[in-house]
């Protein structure tokens, strides 16, 4: 053998002639073929192409290509064909995730909840409830809470404080002589500006995928109380209605802005995809489908000492 | 003494066709895979053609496949190219040579083929 | 399939060392150490002169001598006789039973 090795020179394998009895080293064979006659003492080993519907993935010195796996069983979906250098893998579709060999939708985050950590093909969604300041309107599986609208970026003022599940309602001042316009650090209304109202439906549910605290321990059970008792305010079932009260003695002019129609309005939704999986905390080994009536489909598949 | 001897060599029209032949002595025929060789007038080597000891594959140069077909008889020692649909880039001597795992260790003397009008 | 690179021409001094160059890449003389040189006078066939990067058939001198590095192969010729001066073609296989030669480099002896 020759003294030079590079680091792309291929690589070899043992053959016994069987007309000789001579044990010859032979070069292997590249990805996506096989080796259809062996060297010999005066000639190179034959590669050929592997057949439709069989695979290798290395360079190799085996006599046949493997089965690829067989079709990706519903509701998989193909990540990779069976081809000469691939076998078939297979993948949960988009707003699902591997679960027991099969494939569960994605958790979706009732209102209140936003998600936390996107789902993916091999991990479910994780959610978490909307932090102070921050809410979210509607179910969803792609949708993080939203920060509330800041209703004086917009020249308005706020009419009813936003929730976990509603955004701020903003409206305009009525008109003002200049002698009494207000200053602009002056308070308007008689309640702190985050106050914040648990109207929770007694449908209300938190699903497998959520989590009242940034654990990564998923939550089975609902809340005793919202995240809002934790960070310190106290739920008051009468404040929203006695609120609005207050505002309309106070301010009986007042203009209530629809602001998620408005040009202002920075909460558009947005359906996002679900990220495929980079190799996450679920195995993020691809699926494959059942084999096609060979018993080395077990433990060391397609393992062969001639192809590594 | 391994020898190898072409033949068939000669002038021939674009578009038409010739068939070579090497005869092979002095070693066993059948073990060895065989190889065409050509070098165009003050021009370099060019692989043009092999073919496995039993005849079951072979290969071709991209220049010429689809055009011409190595074949070979073990029972009479003999490699064959025949060339079809030669163009005036054809023009070459044609050496066979006998491949010994991935070298020539044998050449023949070359035939020489002219394809012009 | 390309060829490999050689430079067209080479010269040295009786006595003196030459050494020709054959770049190929990954594919072909990276992938293989299966690099061939022949020695050709002008009107004959081809002489193989060192074949698996290194090796010498028998009745080709030690002067004779060949290496690879990498994309790389090289014949050194060494203690230049007049008898030397020829063509030389180096050839790599490229897999799938393909082979690639270079353009040749013509070697003189001053």
């Known amino acids: 053998q020759p003294e030079q090795k590079a680091s792309n020179l291929i690589g070899t394998y043992r053959h016994v002639d069987r007309a000789t009895g001579q044990v010859l080293t032979c070069d292997k064979c590249p990805a996506g073929t096989y080796v259809s006659e062996h060297c010999t003492n005066t000639s190179l080993r034959v590669c050929s192409s592997c057949p439709v519907g069989t695979f290798t993935r290395h360079e190799n010195g085996i006599e046949k290509c493997h089965d690829c796996s067989q079709p990706c069983p519903w509701p998989m979906i193909e990540k990779l064909p069976c081809a000469a250098l691939t076998d078939r893998e297979c993948t949960c579709p988009p707003g699902m995730f591997q679960s027991n060999a099969t494939c569960a939708p994605h958790t979706v985050c009732p209102v209140g909840w936003g998600v936390r950590k996107k789902g993916t093909e091999t991990e479910d969604v994780r959610c978490k409830q909307c932090a102070r300041g921050t809410f979210s309107d509607v179910p969803s599986s792609v949708m993080k809470c939203k920060a509330y609208t800041d209703c004086l970026s917009q020249n308005l003022v706020v009419i009813k404080p936003g929730t976990k599940e509603t955004d701020n309602v903003c409206g305009t001042l009525p008109s003002f002589s200049s002698s009494t316009s207000p200053s602009p650090g002056t308070a308007i209304f008689p309640r702190p500006e985050h106050m914040e109202t648990h109207e929770v439906p007694s449908s209300t549910y938190v699903p497998k995928g959520m989590n009242s605290t940034e654990s990564n321990s998923s939550a089975s059970v609902r809340p005793k109380v919202l995240s809002s008792i934790q960070e310190g305010t106290v739920p008051d079932n009468t404040s929203s209605a006695r609120g609005k009260e207050d505002v309309n003695k106070t301010l009986p002019n007042l203009q209530v802005v629809n602001h998620q129609q408005g040009p202002h309005h920075r909460h558009i939704l947005k359906l996002l995809p679900s990220m495929e999986a980079t190799g996450g905390e679920k195995s993020s080994t691809p699926i494959k489908g059942p084999k096609r009536g060979h018993p080395r489909q077990n433990l060391h598949k397609h393992f062969d000492i001639n192809e590594h | 003494e391994v020898q190898l001897l072409e033949s068939g060599g000669g002038l021939v029209q674009p578009g038409g066709s010739l068939r070579l032949s090497c005869a092979a002595s002095?070693?066993?025929?059948?073990?060895?895979?065989m190889t065409w060789v050509r070098q165009a007038p003050g021009k370099g080597l060019e692989w043009v053609s092999s073919?496995?000891?039993?005849?079951?594959?072979?290969w071709y140069a991209d220049s010429v496949k689809g055009r011409f077909t190595i074949s070979r008889d073990n029972s009479k020692n003999t490699l064959y190219l025949q060339m079809n649909s030669l163009r005036a880039e054809d023009t070459a001597v044609y050496y066979c040579?006998?491949?010994?795992?991935?070298?020539?260790?044998?050449w023949g003397q070359g035939t020489l083929v002219t394809v012009s009008s | 399939q390309s060829e490999l690179t050689q430079p067209p021409s080479a010269s040295g001094s009786p006595g003196q060392s030459v050494t020709i160059s054959c770049t190929g890449t990954?594919?072909?003389?990276?992938?293989?150490?299966?690099i061939s040189w022949f020695q050709q006078h002008p009107g004959k066939a081809p002489k193989l002169m060192i074949y698996?990067?290194?090796k010498r058939p028998s009745g080709v001198p030690d002067r004779f001598s060949g290496s690879k590095s990498d994309n790389t192969a090289s014949l050194t010729v060494s203690g230049l006789q007049a008898e030397d001066e020829a063509d030389y073609y180096c050839?790599?296989?490229?897999?799938?039973?393909?082979?690639?030669f270079g353009g040749g480099t013509k070697l003189t002896v001053l």
């Open positions: 040579a006998r491949t010994n795992l991935s070298y020539f260790d044998y």
């Open positions: 050839t790599s296989y490229a897999g799938s039973h393909k082979w690639v």
């Open positions: 698996e990067v290194n």
């Open positions: 002095g070693f066993t025929f059948s073990p060895y895979s």
């Open positions: 990954s594919n072909d003389v990276g992938s293989y150490n299966y």
């Open positions: 073919i496995v000891p039993s005849g079951g594959k072979t």
